[in-house]
């Protein structure tokens, strides 16, 4: 048969965060190539990356289409040059995904601290709210309108000359915070979603400190 | 099941430090904030202070602080609460407790320290 | 800071009363706030997160309710098995604070 030297994919892996979604595999193919499918557990099967060579396929568009959805993929394995063979049971070989449920699997990506704004003892801090590739109405929603209230974010800061860290919560994106008038202070954030048993928190933002560019003063 | 396991009594000399552990199984403590609680005789909850095992960040109440150290090994998945310069009022049940975000939705079962010489 | 101010500090009340317990901050704490029983000799235990919703295993009759400085729990029908001490916990800023706790007996 033409499938003699044909090898099923394996270590089908989920990459995703913030909802961009590629389906990672091996091994690099040698005299073969691969087709994806994927489908929802009750919908039909749909081909993407058509006889690719690469051990990857972006699978956002399809995913971003409901994120609460449970997803399966499957990777068909053809020879090269002879893609209308089969095995030996009358069908290409594959392997199949694990499940992934964007909403409860996707990575959080790295937050970002878009601008902080000191009135006397007090300071803002905003999260900036990043767009997502998941649509509605023709339009690409915030993290925030994704998630809602299920997103948290965890703010820690310190002042500059000090090593005592202080830590607040957030249900939207902005922070006001108590500070000592006259002293300059450092700030993090952390994306978490309480309600997950996995993939709950983001790394730390980039350390933003006051007396830098992204502040603003005002007595 | 989510389980938080501490170390056992402890009796110490005032003016020494004391180290409790806090075991977690059933989860991974770098996906949660881990926080230390202290609780006195016949009295209210008191919280000492917290860590986030993922980034080392720790806070404490302002009332423990350089007295205290939190710190956790991810490796072990162990919390850890060093509280030093001990004195009689530091007798007390210390209890460590997993935050989610949302809560401090499992606690240990509680370490007593007597500090008596 | 943030001041948790816990009331009543004790109460009695018959089997089948309806008890209410209210916790102030002292601003707002944008319902990080949770309810914990603790019995003696025991470590406490999770009631309500979130100011509203029911922990894994807690019994209907417990609910919370409020936002931004006013939380209230409240046991719609009290049980023998209710008595003990309830504390509210603001862990939306550290330094995170206790209310005083409330003392719950039988009549």
């Known amino acids: 048969s033409g499938t003699t030297n044909t090898v099923a994919a394996y270590n089908l892996t989920w990459k995703s965060t913030n909802f961009k979604t590629i389906l990672e595999w091996e091994p690099k193919p040698v005299n073969q190539v691969y087709t994806v499918q994927i489908s929802t557990k009750s919908g039909d099967w749909k081909s993407k990356c058509f006889y690719t060579t690469d051990t990857e396929c972006d699978l956002t568009d399809e995913i971003v289409k409901d994120v609460k959805q449970t997803y399966l993929a499957r990777v068909f394995s053809y020879p090269a040059g002879n893609v209308e063979s089969t095995g030996s049971a009358g069908e290409p070989l594959y392997e199949n995904s694990p499940e992934f449920t964007p909403y409860l699997e996707t990575n959080l990506g790295q937050p970002t601290i878009q601008s902080f704004e000191q009135v006397g003892t007090k300071v803002n801090v905003t999260v900036e709210d990043e767009r997502t590739l998941v649509r509605r109405n023709n339009t690409f929603l915030s993290l925030r309108d994704v998630f809602g209230k299920d997103l948290i974010y965890t703010l820690y800061y310190w002042k500059s000359s000090s090593s005592g860290k202080k830590t607040a919560k957030t249900n939207t994106n902005e922070f006001l915070i108590d500070v000592d008038k006259g002293e300059n202070y450092c700030f993090s954030v952390q994306a978490v979603i309480p309600s997950r048993t996995v993939n709950r928190k983001s790394t730390d933002s980039p350390v933003e400190c006051m007396g830098q560019e992204k502040g603003e003063f005002r007595e | 099941q989510v389980q938080l396991l501490e170390s056992g009594a402890v009796l110490a000399r005032p003016g020494t430090s004391v180290k409790i552990s806090c075991k977690a199984s059933?989860?991974?403590?770098?996906?949660?904030?881990m926080h230390w609680v202290k609780q006195r005789p016949g009295q209210g909850l008191e919280w000492i202070g917290g860590?986030?095992?993922?980034?080392?960040?720790?806070m404490y109440d302002p009332k423990f602080q350089g007295r205290v150290t939190i710190t956790a090994d991810t490796s072990t998945n162990t919390a850890y609460m060093e509280l030093s310069s001990l004195r009689s009022e530091d007798t007390a049940i210390y209890y460590c407790?997993?935050?989610?975000?949302?809560?401090?939705?499992?606690w240990g079962q509680g370490t007593l320290v007597t500090v008596s010489s | 800071d943030i001041q948790m101010t816990q009331s009543p500090s004790s109460l009695s009340a018959s089997v089948g009363d309806r008890v209410t317990i209210t916790c102030k901050a002292s601003?707002?704490?944008?319902?990080?706030l949770s309810w914990y029983q603790q019995k003696p000799g025991k470590a406490p235990k999770l009631l309500i997160y979130?100011?509203?919703s029911l922990a894994d295993g807690v019994p209907s009759r417990f609910s919370g309710s409020g936002s931004g400085t006013d939380y209230t729990l409240t046991i719609s029908s009290l049980q023998p098995e209710d008595i003990a001490t309830y504390y509210c916990l603001q862990h939306g800023e550290s330094p995170y604070t206790f209310g005083g706790g409330t003392k719950v007996e039988i009549k």
């Open positions: 860590n986030d095992p993922a980034n080392g960040h720790s």
């Open positions: 601003q707002d704490i944008k319902s990080f």
């Open positions: 407790a997993r935050d989610s975000g949302y809560a401090m939705d499992y």
């Open positions: 979130y100011a509203t």
């Open positions: 059933g989860f991974n403590i770098k996906d949660y904030y």
